[in-house]
């Protein structure tokens, strides 16, 4: 028997063992989270198939998502989004520490999909473990991207009070409009339920005491916020480390000078 | 004292190019999001583009969309409008004016007159 | 067709108050800044509120006021240096574009 054509992208395969993770996840996820407990993960994995398995990998919409979407529709109180930007494992490390605070991966889609990639192929039932399309050289409309496009346009949209965005200040784009935060997040926060954004800039160099809140990347994020009617303050976090020890530990005398 | 100052509008026939510039003094021009808006005579007013401070986002009114271009050099604090493929309708008088955050349009230009016509 | 609607016209004799309106929608006026601006004949437009709140150095006799997808500017004790084009605007979220009304030319009698 001749083996099938395969399209060849640019991109790494789907993750291995990317069904039994995501169906594992899911069990996980719903015996620590008692609010997500009616959650049925044989469901959960169905709808999350079903958004990219038989379909071009490189037509995929927000729609394909939405059964998905549906069962995992979960709230975060006010006041207690993290959103963050090109920081990922700083602002993980902050929510497991502070525990009633959420990043998107902290919600049960986002701790589904994070640092896992799929993809399927047009017209069969299987997973390709070989390729998947790139954002870059083969297209964005792929099944991961479009995923995170869509929960991430979600949690945005459910957010309220005054929501947090951890942004890398190392970078030189401090707040870049091609990220998932500038490019969907920061556009889909609700003015009639968020009252104000507070951006955290990180400081990468232990010298650093530039005040990184006067970036014109930042002062571009304040004037989009602005026309939304979304009060914008800013906040430096000159050392990262005291800053998570100082979540963990607030009663350390050290706590009491500035981070 | 804060100003803003239009210049390069003309006489041009329709399919023509022109570049309008709007020099900035009396602030820090770099802190500021800016705008193009146009008024033709006897209209109200339109607006046609903006650019985010650092130059990477720009916005533009669907009936300029893919002819016009707004650009800024911070460094020599001018805002540009570079209109290509000039239409009767775009014959109006342009301002340029700076956004301020939860302002609005603070500073106005005294504007420039742009006639297309053959 | 503007995205704003405002009156074409208003009047109004010395010391009376006049209100001019401006409807939107959701994605521009009542989720976003809305300001109003007052072009004097044959000058530029100038700003003239800010939601609700006046820049320093416009009279307090402007007020602005705003209700779900409506606002409207309020001149009380009316005076004839106040006739004037009137033009309030909106940051449209779902346009990415700033939306003007039609404008309101302010007769004083």
């Known amino acids: 028997v001749l083996p099938r054509w395969r399209q060849q992208w640019s991109g790494s395969g789907t993750t291995s063992r990317f069904p039994e993770t995501v169906l594992a996840r899911c069990v996980k996820y719903t015996e620590v989270h008692p609010e997500m407990r009616h959650v049925d993960c044989q469901s959960v994995w169905d709808a999350f198939k079903g958004a990219f398995i038989s379909k071009y990998p490189c037509n995929i919409t927000e729609e394909d998502y939405q059964p998905l979407v549906k069962l995992g529709t979960q709230t975060v109180p006010c006041n207690k989004t993290l959103l963050w930007s090109r920081i990922k494992d700083l602002a993980h490390q902050f929510t497991q520490v502070q525990r009633d605070m959420f990043t998107l991966e902290d919600m049960l889609l986002g701790y589904l999909a994070d640092d896992l990639t799929w993809c399927g192929e047009f017209n069969t039932f299987e997973i390709n473990y070989q390729s998947c399309p790139d954002w870059r050289k083969d297209c964005s409309n792929n099944p991961v991207s479009v995923f995170w496009k869509t929960v991430s346009r979600r949690f945005a949209e459910t957010a309220c009070g005054v929501v947090h965005v951890m942004l890398n200040g190392s970078r030189s784009k401090i707040f870049d409009k091609n990220s998932t935060f500038g490019s969907v997040e920061v556009h889909n926060l609700q003015p009639e339920k968020v009252q104000a954004l507070e951006a955290w800039v990180i400081h990468g160099g232990r010298e650093d005491s530039r005040d990184l809140c006067q970036d014109p990347t930042i002062k571009e994020l304040e004037s989009i916020i602005s026309k939304r009617n979304i009060r914008f303050f800013c906040k430096n976090i000159y050392r990262p480390d005291k800053f998570l020890q100082c979540v963990k530990n607030p009663e350390d005398s050290s706590c009491l000078s500035g981070i | 004292e804060v100003q803003l100052l239009e210049s390069g509008g003309g006489l041009v026939q329709p399919g023509g190019s022109l570049r309008l510039s709007c020099a900035a003094s009396?602030?820090?021009?770099?802190?500021?999001?800016m705008n193009w808006v146009r008024q033709a005579p006897g209209k109200g007013l339109e607006w046609v583009s903006a650019?985010?401070?650092?130059?990477?986002?720009?916005y533009y009114a669907d009936s300029v969309k893919g002819r016009f271009t707004i650009s800024r050099d911070n460094s020599e604090n001018t805002l540009y409008l570079q209109m290509n493929n000039l239409r009767a309708e775009d014959t109006a008088v342009y301002y340029c004016?700076?956004?301020?955050?939860?302002?609005?349009?603070?500073?106005w230009g005294r504007g420039t007159t742009v006639t297309v016509s053959s | 067709q503007s995205v704003l609607t405002q009156p074409p016209s208003a009047s109004g004799t010395p010391g009376q108050r006049v209100t001019i309106s401006c409807s939107g929608s959701?994605?521009?006026?009542?989720?976003?800044?809305v300001n109003w601006y007052q072009q004097l004949p044959g000058t530029a437009p100038k700003l003239l509120i800010y939601?609700?709140q006046r820049p320093s150095g416009v009279p307090d006799r402007f007020s602005g006021s705003k209700s779900g997808t409506s606002a409207s500017l309020a001149i009380s004790g009316l005076q004839s240096e106040d006739e004037a084009d009137y033009y309030c605007?909106?940051?449209?979220?779902?346009?990415?574009?700033?939306?003007f009304g039609g404008g309101t030319k302010l007769t004083v009698l």
């Open positions: 004016a700076n956004y301020k955050s939860y302002y609005g349009m603070d500073v």
């Open positions: 009396g602030f820090t021009f770099s802190d500021y999001e």
């Open positions: 650019i985010s401070i650092t130059g990477s986002w720009t």
């Open positions: 959701r994605s521009n006026i009542r989720n976003n800044l």
């Open positions: 939601n609700t």
């Open positions: 605007a909106s940051w449209d979220a779902s346009l990415n574009a700033w939306v």
